[in-house]
Interface confidence: medium
């Protein structure tokens, strides 16, 4: 059962699967300037029986330009760079969940794929919040969501995180500099779209903090 | 089951001081941050303090900065709010709350007179 | 700080019916919007946090929407127990604010 909304939006906060439940869906993108193969698949699929989980399909992206050729370019170190980190490295981090039965790890990266990755995400999956760079969390212990089925309809949990400006401990979190704000990820109430573009370059970044960077809803 | 019980309100004079307490249960205090908020009668409500789970960061409303002093022992998962020169303004009811987001729970509330 | 106004202030309406909320900011708070119930008496609790996911336990007549400015809570067949005063909260930046409140009581 697919998760009908995106997890919830914190401010100062991106979110990361550790690891995707089985029937979890990755869009096929492809950056500007390429498109899929015509044979290529929509989207991969983590499927699996009871002993391996593993990602169903392969994305491929050819040149827009050259119509009939599959001929990918290496990309750019600067593109390499961005793709480095897909898993958060923080002395922090939750429990590998990847290691658990039914589960995918982060796919690699597919040549000239779209900067951004969107998730289709299944009940019972996991995200965990860390604050963005410059931020630190108010809450300690791992800042986690789920993905729930109650009553017929799927809904995430609510994770108890504050992310606050270090610099500015005199008055309110949320009045510092405005370069984090969450303006930046727009979010459709419909959609169950999920992306972490945001996460995967911030968190190389924000993986050098020392402060506890998670925390849980507790219900 | 998530409990905040709060205690120490009551009445006292303009300029006095006053302790609010609240006692948790039910929930990892010393992982959580903690807040109080207000609600003057039959008025809205209003954020008074905010305190991180290790008390390390506090943060205070502009009217009450320099008055108010949230703390927590988190041996005894208590919250505090010293509130010092109280003005007649501050009367209201005080609720401790787990900071969150918003406020996830909430306490029933304790009633701050403050009047001569 | 960035304030929240709610309209009506005041609302009567009979069992059965839809009632809509209406809570608008000063600026644009990206969804970060929550609603509570307070009853008589009682403490606040919240209903919708993040503009429309419902709280553990809440009625599936209660609904959230609303982007930048503008946000709204329904209840979809309102019930004798909804009487209550609804407040909407931002939490995009400090300091947490409220809405005046919603006092909503039976025909």
């Known amino acids: 059962e697919l998760c009908d909304d995106d997890p919830p939006e914190i401010p100062h906060a991106t979110f990361k699967a550790m690891a995707y439940k089985e029937g979890t869906m990755l869009n096929c993108e492809c950056k500007r300037g390429f498109r899929r193969i015509k044979s290529g698949s929509l989207y991969m699929l983590c499927t699996g029986n009871s002993s391996h989980s593993s990602w169903d399909n392969q994305c491929q992206c050819t040149s827009s330009a050259t119509r009939n050729t599959t001929k990918q370019v290496t990309p750019q170190p600067e593109e390499q760079k961005e793709r480095k980190t897909t898993e958060m490295q923080s002395p922090m981090q939750p429990v590998d969940q990847a290691s658990l039965p039914g589960h995918c790890r982060e796919p690699p990266p597919w040549e000239n794929e779209a900067t951004e990755r969107i998730y289709h995400f299944v009940v019972g999956q996991m995200v965990y919040y860390q604050c963005v760079q410059g931020y630190r969390a108010l809450h300690r212990g791992p800042a986690e969501s789920v993905c729930k089925m109650t009553h017929g309809k799927t809904r995430w949990t609510q994770p108890q995180l504050i992310c606050t400006g270090e610099m500015e401990t005199s008055q309110f979190p949320g009045e510092e500099k405005p370069q984090a704000s969450p303006e930046g990820r727009p979010e459709s109430e419909t959609s169950c779209l999920v992306t972490t573009t945001d996460f995967q370059i911030q968190t190389e970044m924000a993986a050098t903090m020392e402060t506890s960077i998670f925390t849980t809803e507790y219900q | 089951e998530v409990q905040l019980v709060e205690s120490g309100g009551g009445l006292v004079q303009p300029g006095r001081s006053m302790k609010l307490s609240c006692a948790a249960s039910g929930f990892p205090f010393s992982d959580h941050a903690m807040a109080w908020v207000r609600q003057a009668p039959k008025k809205g409500l209003q954020w008074v303090a905010y305190i991180s789970y290790d008390g390390d960061n506090t943060y205070y409303r502009d009217s009450v900065k320099g008055r108010f002093t949230i703390s927590r022992d988190n041996a005894r998962s208590t919250l505090f709010l010293q509130m010092d020169s109280l003005r007649s303004e501050d009367t209201a009811t005080y609720y401790c709350?787990?900071?969150?987001?918003?406020?996830?729970?909430w306490g029933q509330g304790v009633m701050v007179t403050v009047s001569s | 700080d960035i304030q929240m106004t709610q309209s009506p202030s005041f609302l009567s309406a009979s069992v059965g019916d839809r009632v809509t909320i209406n809570c608008k900011a000063s600026q644009n708070v990206n969804k970060f919007l929550n609603w509570y119930q307070q009853k008589l008496g009682e403490a606040p609790r919240r209903l919708i946090y993040g503009t429309n996911s419902l709280q553990t336990g809440i009625p599936s007549r209660f609904s959230g929407s609303g982007s930048g400015t503008d946000y709204t809570l329904t209840i979809s067949s309102l019930q004798p127990e909804d009487v209550a005063t609804y407040f909407c909260q931002q939490y995009s930046s400090w300091p947490w604010t409220f809405g005046g409140g919603t006092k909503l009581e039976l025909k």
């Open positions: 709350t787990t900071g969150g987001n918003s406020g996830y729970d």
